[in-house]
Amino acid sequence: QRFAQAQQQLPLESLGWDVAELQLNHTGPQQDPRLYWQGGPALGRSFLHGPELDKGQLRIHRDGIYMVHIQVTLAICSSTTASRHHPTTLAVGICSPASRSISLLRLSFHQGCTIASQRLTPLARGDTLCTNLTGTLLPSRNTDETFFGVQWVRP
Amino acid sequence: QRFAQAQQQLPLESLGWDVAELQLNHTGPQQDPRLYWQGGPALGRSFLHGPELDKGQLRIHRDGIYMVHIQVTLAICSSTTASRHHPTTLAVGICSPASRSISLLRLSFHQGCTIASQRLTPLARGDTLCTNLTGTLLPSRNTDETFFGVQWVRP
Amino acid sequence: QRFAQAQQQLPLESLGWDVAELQLNHTGPQQDPRLYWQGGPALGRSFLHGPELDKGQLRIHRDGIYMVHIQVTLAICSSTTASRHHPTTLAVGICSPASRSISLLRLSFHQGCTIASQRLTPLARGDTLCTNLTGTLLPSRNTDETFFGVQWVRP
C-alpha cells in the first residue's frame, strides 16, 4: 500500500534522523575504564549526523527513543586467554549529567572474545554515553570488530 | 548540513524504507566461503522490499545508511565441537564492486555455536554484501537460527 | 516539540512508530518456560508506545515489519556454572493466535551467561510474542542485563 498521498509530506529534517556510528580511538589511562571513540568519513565508515563527540564520548543532541548498539572484540584473544583473563565486562551507560547516570546495557565476555548487543532506550539532549570496559584485555581497534552507534527511532 | 528547506518536503514513500530479511539457502562449493541466501514470502518469513538477490548475495538498490544485522548458528555444534573446530569466523562485507570491497562486520565462534551482531554502515546503490563463513562447520538452515538482513535508516 | 503542522504533513501516529522496550518481571511457574515482561516509565526506562502487554506477553497492535531484539543474562552464572547447567536455550516466537504460532529467533547459552540478538520479521495486529527460556537457571532481572523490545520499521 502507498504510505501517503503526494500532498501530505514531512520535512525530512523534522523527522530527526540523528544517527552515529563510531570506531574505537583508544582506551583510557590505567584507572579510567572508558573507551574513547572517534567518527567521521575521513576515518572510514564511521559518521556522526546529529550527535557529537565530547572527549571521545558520545553526546546526544535530540530527545527521543534511540536504538543503541555495540560490538567489542578483545584484541589478543582466544578461548583460553578469554577464560584466563576472565572476567571482562562491558557496560554502556549515561555518565553525564550525573543526575541521569545509569547503566543501560551490560555484558560479560565468557570464554568468548566478542560481545555484541543492542537496546532501545530514551535519551535526552545533553546525555553523554560512556562505554566502560573492565578487565586486563585490550579491545581491537579494527573497524569491523569494534564499533558503537546510536540511531534515533522516535520522539 | 541542513537536510531540507522547510518548503522542500518529501513524499513519505520516497524516504526509501528499503528492507530485507533473508534465510540461508546453502553454502558455497569447497573453495567458496560465501553463504548463499534466499528470501520471499513463499519461503516463510523472509522478504525483500527494495534490495535484491544476485546469485544468493544481497544487492543494495538505494543509497543510504543501513542497519545490517546477522545471526548464524552452527549446525552440529556444542561447546566442545565449537572449540575443537576453532577458529570459525563470520565476516560480512561489501564484495562488489571491487573498488568498494571492505569488511563491515567480523565475529568468531569461541566455544559458542551462535554469533549475532548488527551495525550501522553507509551503503550505495549497487553494493553487494557477502557473508563469508570460514571453518569446517556447517551453518544451520533453520530460519530462527540463521538469518541476515538490512534496514535502510536514513539518506 | 510538535512534529509537523496538520495541514502540510503526516500526523506522527500515522507513521506507525510503534515501539516497546520491556524489562523482566518474573519467570513462570515450574512447567511454564515463558518469561513475563513489564514496561512503563514508572518502572524505569521501559516503555510501550503502541504494543500492549497481555499477562506479561507482548501483543502487537499494528501490522508491519518489526525489528525484534532481546538480551537475556542468566543470574546465577559465571563461566563455570554456565557450562554445568547447559543446555539453556532462549526462543522468541509468535505464540498466539495459534494459527500463526512460529519460532522467530532461537539461541543457546554455550559456556556463556548472556545471549543477545535481533531480527526483522513481519508481525500482524493481534500477534502475541512469547519468550521461552528452557533450563534450570534463572534470568537476571537487572534492567541493563535482560530486556526485550520491538520497533515498527515499515508496513
Partner: antibody, heavy 123, light 108 residues
Framework: EVQLLESGGGLVQPGGSLRLSCAAS????????MSWVRQAPGKGLEWVSA????????YYADSVKGRFTISRDNSKNTLYLQMNSLRAEDTAVYYC????????????????WGQGTLVTVSS | DIQMTQSPSSLSASVGDRVTITCRAS??????LNWYQQKRGKAPKLLIH???SLASGVPSRFSGSGSGTDFTLTISSLQPEDFATYYC??????????FGQGTKVEIK
C-alpha cells in the same frame, strides 16, 4: 582460593563514625558485585548495602540510607563501608559478601562471605 | 520492601529425620528465592538458589521447592552437621534483597 577479610570494627559512641574494609583475594574483584550484610547479636541476617562491579550502581537498605556509604577500590581489591551517625541498633557483626555472578551486576546470590567484623555502638 | 516470613522459628529433630522449613513472601517473587545455612559463629553458606537448584558442593539430601509466594526447604535425612540456622532470602527485587528471620534446627 577466594578470601574476604573484614576489618575496621570496634566500639564507637552513638553519633560516631567508623569505616569498615573488606580485602578480597582469589578472584577478579572488579567483576563482582559486593554487599555488606549484618547480624545483630542473637538475631537474623540483614542486608545493608551493595555496589556493582564497576562501582557505578550503589544500593542501600532503608535503615542506613543517608548514613552509610559503600565504595570500592578495584585497584586495591578492597570494599569499604563508611558508617556515620551510628546508632545503638547498628550494633552487629558486619559481613562482606560477593555475588555469585561475574557480570558485575547485583543479583543477590551471596556465595562467598568473610568471617565478619563486630561493630558495637554504645555509650 | 518484600517481607519474608519463615516458619517455624525453631524446631527440634533427630538424626535421620525428615525436616521441612517453609518461607512465605509478602508478594509474588517467582522462583527468585535462595536458602542459606549458618552454623554458630560462622558466616552463612548458600545452599539453594532459584528455589530449587542446589548450590555447588551441597549434599543432595537438601532440596527446595515452591514458586510465587510459598517455598519449602527439605532435608530428607538430617545429619549431625545439619544442625544450624536456615535463612530464606528473596532475590526478586533489583534494589534490595531481604532475608527471613531464620529457623533454628536443634537436636532433640
Amino acid at each position: 582460593e577466594v578470601q574476604l577479610l573484614e576489618s575496621g570494627g570496634g566500639l564507637v559512641q552513638p553519633g560516631g563514625s567508623l569505616r569498615l574494609s573488606c580485602a578480597a583475594s582469589g578472584f577478579t574483584f572488579s567483576q563482582y558485585s559486593m554487599s555488606w550484610v549484618r547480624q545483630a547479636p542473637g538475631k537474623g541476617l540483614e542486608w545493608v548495602s551493595a555496589i556493582s562491579g564497576g562501582g557505578v550502581s550503589t544500593y542501600y537498605a532503608d535503615s542506613v540510607k543517608g548514613r552509610f556509604t559503600i565504595s570500592r577500590d578495584n585497584s586495591k581489591n578492597t570494599l569499604y563501608l563508611q558508617m556515620n551517625s551510628l546508632r545503638a541498633e547498628d550494633t552487629a557483626v558486619y559481613y562482606c559478601a560477593s555475588d555469585i555472578s561475574d557480570s558485575g551486576g547485583s543479583h543477590w546470590y551471596f556465595d562467598y562471605w568473610g568471617q565478619g567484623t563486630l561493630v558495637t555502638v554504645s555509650s | 520492601d518484600i517481607q519474608m516470613t519463615q516458619s517455624p522459628s525453631s524446631l527440634s529433630a533427630s538424626v535421620g529425620d525428615r525436616v521441612t522449613i517453609t518461607c512465605r513472601a509478602s508478594q509474588y517473587i517467582g522462583r527468585y528465592l535462595n536458602w542459606y545455612q549458618q552454623k554458630r559463629g560462622k558466616a552463612p553458606k548458600l545452599l539453594i538458589h532459584g528455589a530449587t537448584s542446589l548450590a555447588s558442593g551441597v549434599p543432595s539430601r537438601f532440596s527446595g521447592s515452591g514458586s510465587g509466594t510459598d517455598f519449602t526447604l527439605t532435608i530428607s535425612s538430617l545429619q549431625p552437621e545439619d544442625f544450624a540456622t536456615y535463612y530464606c532470602q528473596q532475590s526478586y527485587s533489583t534494589t534490595s534483597p531481604t532475608f527471613g528471620q531464620g529457623t533454628k534446627v536443634e537436636i532433640k
